[in-house]
Every structure is written in C-alpha cells, then in structure tokens.
Amino acid sequence: ACDTATCVTHRLAGLLSRSGGVVKNNFVPTNVGSKAF
C-alpha cells in the first residue's frame, strides 16, 4: 500500500466518509500511522 503523506490523507478521508465521520477526533492524517489502516 502507498504510505506517502498524500495517500495516507486520501485513505483517511475515504475511511471517514464510509464511517459517516463517526471516529475519534484525533484520528487525523498527521497522527495516524499507515498501520492504522
């Protein structure tokens, strides 16, 4: 999987979209590692 900063951000955006945004507030690109996916 792509682990660049941009890939991580897009992947998290997709995850947030699928979850309806119901995730922890601190679940943001800069403090989740690729392992979070």
């Epitope: 792509c2 660049t4 900063a5 941009t6 890939c7 951000t9 955006a13 800069t30």
Partner: antibody, heavy 119, light 107 residues
Framework: EVQLVQSGAEVKKPGASVKVSCKAS????????MNWVRQAPGQRLEWIGV????????TYNRKFKGRATLTVDKSASTAYMELSSLRSEDTAVYYC????????????WGQGTTVTVSS | DIQMTQSPSSLSASVGDRVTITCKAS??????VAWYQQKPGKSPKALIY???YRYSGVPSRFSGSGSGTDFTLTISSLQPEDVATYHC?????????FGQGTKLEIK
Amino acid sequence: EVQLVQSGAEVKKPGASVKVSCKASGYTFTDYYMNWVRQAPGQRLEWIGVINPYNVRTTYNRKFKGRATLTVDKSASTAYMELSSLRSEDTAVYYCASLLIRPHYFDYWGQGTTVTVSS
Amino acid sequence: DIQMTQSPSSLSASVGDRVTITCKASQNVGTNVAWYQQKPGKSPKALIYSASYRYSGVPSRFSGSGSGTDFTLTISSLQPEDVATYHCQQYNFYPYTFGQGTKLEIK
C-alpha cells in the same frame, strides 16, 4: 475560510539562503501535512518535500536534501522552507500546499513566493 | 524517481470540443495520480485525485481515468475559462513528480 498566505518576493545573491513562510488559517494546522513545491520559469512543477507539523517529521526530495530545511512554528500555525547555497537555477516561484479533509476535502495552495537569485 | 510524461505539450481546441490530455508514468503508480489546472500567474488548482475523483466544486465536464502507468484527463466540452496549463502528478512514491504540463488554448 482556509488560507495559506506566503511571504513576499525575495531577491538573493548566489550562495545566500532564503526562508519562505506560509501562514495557515481556517483549519487545525497540526492535523495535516504541508508540502512545498517550486516552479522555475518554463519548467515543470518540482516537489521539494513535506513536513508533518504534528511531530515535525520531514521527507525531502533527494535533489534538495541538505539544502532545503522544512520547519514549523505550531503556535503561529506557520510553516517555513529555507533553501541554502542558492544558485541561479533556484530562481522560481515557491508554493506551500496542504491536502485537507476538514473543513473541506480539498488540496489548498498558497499564492506563491517568487525567489530571484541574481548577482 | 518516477518520470511523468504528458502529451501533448500544447494544444488548441474550439469551445465545445472534447479535449483529452494523457500522462504516462515510468512505472506502476496504481491510481495515485492527481491533476491540476494552472492559470497564468496563479497557483495550481486541484481538479482530480486518485486518478478519477473530482474535488468538490470542480465542474463535471472534467473527468479523469486510468491506472498503473496510463492516465487521462478529459474535458467533455471545452469552455473559454478552461484556458490554462494542466499538470499531472504522481504521489505513490517519494519524491512526488509532475508532468511537464499541457498548455491548452482556444482556437
């Protein structure tokens, strides 16, 4: 409203250094990576590097490693790009850019800072 | 580094035309490609991410496709305000790299 506001144009002599700032507003600065890109006249866009403002980790384009330094001032929501040992080929417009999810899912760019290197 | 080769480097088309710009990566970058529009003297504006997804606010006449090494940006019906230079970018690998740009003009 999300804004990335960059510092003004600079004229530098060869061998000098330049430090460009990028003041972020309208979002949580430490939540999103900050990229730096430049565009020399008539040349393609060129990625310099990226900084994680949360933990201040950086990744650089090898071409700029050792000459470019990315830093942040979290309290001022400002990112900086310093380029040293300037040469004429560094004459370019320098941009900061950040891909956000909130408040809007969009890739925001600063207005650009023109750096001219001339003796 | 990944080379991104755009074609054509410039093109002239009429209002209402369908316009296609291609970008070829020197190796597989999945769908991790973005497209930007840049008007003279302005910053690049994001249009497309993940090869085929439009950012909110981008007109539906812009579409992207492709995966692996071959990517396309299509403008279904060219408008006068589309005069600009278009750039592709891969972000699958560091360093991110851009195509050389395609300058689009109106006939």
